[in-house]
């Protein structure tokens, strides 16, 4: 990944972190009626060798990790990304001010892994 | 963000990069008979606002990008990860020195996206 952290910040292993998102903070309060926000969560952390079972790593991620160890300046570590996502239902105003109930897919992180 | 960039440079968007992996370099030449290596590829690049259609972003990634803009020190950008992976067939020796032909899933990156 293109992100660089200070050497003093030791990153923990890839995992799910809790994150509540307020639609008001996003400036969406005028068109989203409900909910007021939701537990979106996010993934963060290191995908370092060895990738254990908790990291839900793909075969490619395992290979990439080994190549990164051999060639760290050119091949990055795999990144920590969602492996399971859930939908949420949102009540909102459409462009014609109709009230719509819609299910939005892939909104909530349920699990993370190395990819 | 904790990243250091040259302000004059544009960040490169999340995309697939070519990578050939040699099984000899991985030290696997004694048990993998064929192929000698394969085009594994990898994903790298920025998942920055706005996430365009090429970035195959999930709804969660779009929300996370907006939250990152509001709170960059605590919520990272989404990461650039494989969205499509292919299998490869490998001819190898098992623990009993039998020759096995096996299809290994999720070995080759075909496409990348922001997750």
């Amino acid at each position: 990944s293109a992100s660089d952290y200070n050497s003093s910040e030791l990153k923990t292993a890839c995992r799910k972190h809790e994150l509540y998102v307020s639609f008001q903070d996003l400036g969406w309060q005028d068109w989203i009626i409900a909910p007021k926000g939701y537990a979106a969560n996010y993934c963060d952390g290191e995908c370092s060798f060895p990738l254990n079972a908790h990291m839900n790593a793909t075969n490619h991620a395992i290979v990439q990790t080994l190549v990164h160890l051999m060639n760290p300046e050119y091949v990055p570590k795999p990144c920590c990304a969602p492996t399971k996502l859930n939908a949420i239902s949102v009540l909102y105003f459409d462009d014609n001010s109709n009230v719509i109930l819609k299910k939005y897919r892939n909104m909530v992180v349920r699990a993370c892994g190395c990819h | 963000s904790a990243s250091d960039y040259n302000s004059s440079e544009l960040k490169t968007a999340c995309r697939k990069h070519e990578l050939y992996v040699s099984f000899q370099d991985l030290g696997w030449q004694d048990w993998i008979i064929a192929p000698k290596g394969y085009a594994a590829n990898y994903c790298d690049g920025e998942c920055s606002f706005p996430l365009n259609a090429h970035m195959n972003a999930t709804n969660h990634a779009i929300v996370q990008t907006l939250v990152h803009l509001m709170n960059p020190e605590y919520v990272p950008k989404p990461c650039c990860a494989p969205t499509k992976l292919n299998a490869i067939s490998v001819l190898y020796f098992d623990d009993n020195s039998n020759v096995i032909l096996k299809k290994y899933r999720n070995m080759v990156v075909r496409a990348c996206g922001c997750h």
Partner: antibody, heavy 121, light 111 residues
Framework: QVQLVESGGGLVKPGGSLRLSCAAS????????VHWVRQAPGKGLEWVGR??????????MYAAPVKGRFTISRDDSKNTLYLQMNSLKTEDTAVYYC????????????WGQGTLVTVSS | QSVLTQPPSVSGAPGQRVTISCTGS?????????VHWYQQLPGTAPKLLIY???ERPSGVPDRFSGSKSGTSASLAITGLQAEDEADYYC???????????FGGGTKLTVL
């Protein structure tokens, strides 16, 4: 043949600034990750920092002693690497080398001859 | 103090074999990262001697060999020659941030 030539070293007072350059030739500069490494008189090698390629968003990273004071940049059109050094301290006195990273195992396969930076009042 | 630990000096007579150790930790060599070795002759820039633990760039004699085990690596020089007198450095990466780390250097004296 592959060549890296540093320039811009010299005598500077504590708190001063200096910009080092590293001119590359004999290879496709834009395809390589490049680093700065320094060596204080009579001491060992100390990593300063690096800059990645365009494909990795020219990401930079720095060693703790120089972070926030030094900035690495590159101009691929000029095949040149730069090290901008600000708020210099006496302990920054060293020979500064630029080094190219080979692309299969990430070793520093080519080094410049070095340029001496002396920080003294 | 360097992240990787090397003996400050080693010596040997011409024709002998010497080894230089490089001890790291679980966050660098022990994390699986490659180890490289550099030779620095007096008054010159360092030169890549061994890369990826045990591979030699073209032009490096096969008298030089490298190995790695656990959190340590070593450089072996057989058939010692007067021109081998130099400083030798090991180098790897720190796993948490992919920062480059060097050993403190070892001065080889050919007696």
């Amino acid at each position: 043949q592959v060549q890296l030539v540093e320039s811009g070293g010299g005598l500077v007072k504590p708190g001063g600034s200096l910009r080092l350059s590293c001119a590359a030739s004999g290879f496709t500069f834009s395809s390589y990750v490049v680093h700065w490494v320094r060596q204080a008189p009579g001491k060992g090698l100390e990593w300063v920092g690096r800059i990645k390629r365009e494909s990795s968003s020219y990401t930079t990273m720095y060693a703790a002693p120089v972070k926030g004071r030094f900035t690495i940049s590159r101009d691929d059109s000029k095949n040149t690497l730069y090290l901008q050094m600000n708020s210099l301290k006496t302990e920054d006195t060293a020979v500064y080398y630029c080094a190219r990273v080979e692309r299969s195992k990430s070793g520093f396969d080519n080094w410049g001859q070095g340029t001496l930076v002396t920080v003294s009042s | 103090q360097s992240v990787l630990t090397q003996p400050p000096s080693v010596s040997g007579a011409p024709g002998q074999r010497v080894t230089i150790s490089c001890t790291g930790s679980s966050s660098n060599i022990g994390a699986g990262y490659s180890v490289h070795w550099y030779q620095q002759l007096p008054g010159t820039a360092p030169k890549l001697l061994i890369y990826g633990q045990s591979e030699r760039p073209s032009g490096v004699p096969d008298r030089f060999s490298g190995s790695k085990s656990g959190t340590s690596a070593s450089l072996a020089i057989t058939g010692l020659q007067a021109e081998d007198e130099a400083d030798y450095y090991c180098q790897s990466w720190d796993s948490s941030q992919t920062l480059v780390v060097f050993g403190g250097g070892t001065k080889l004296t050919v007696l």
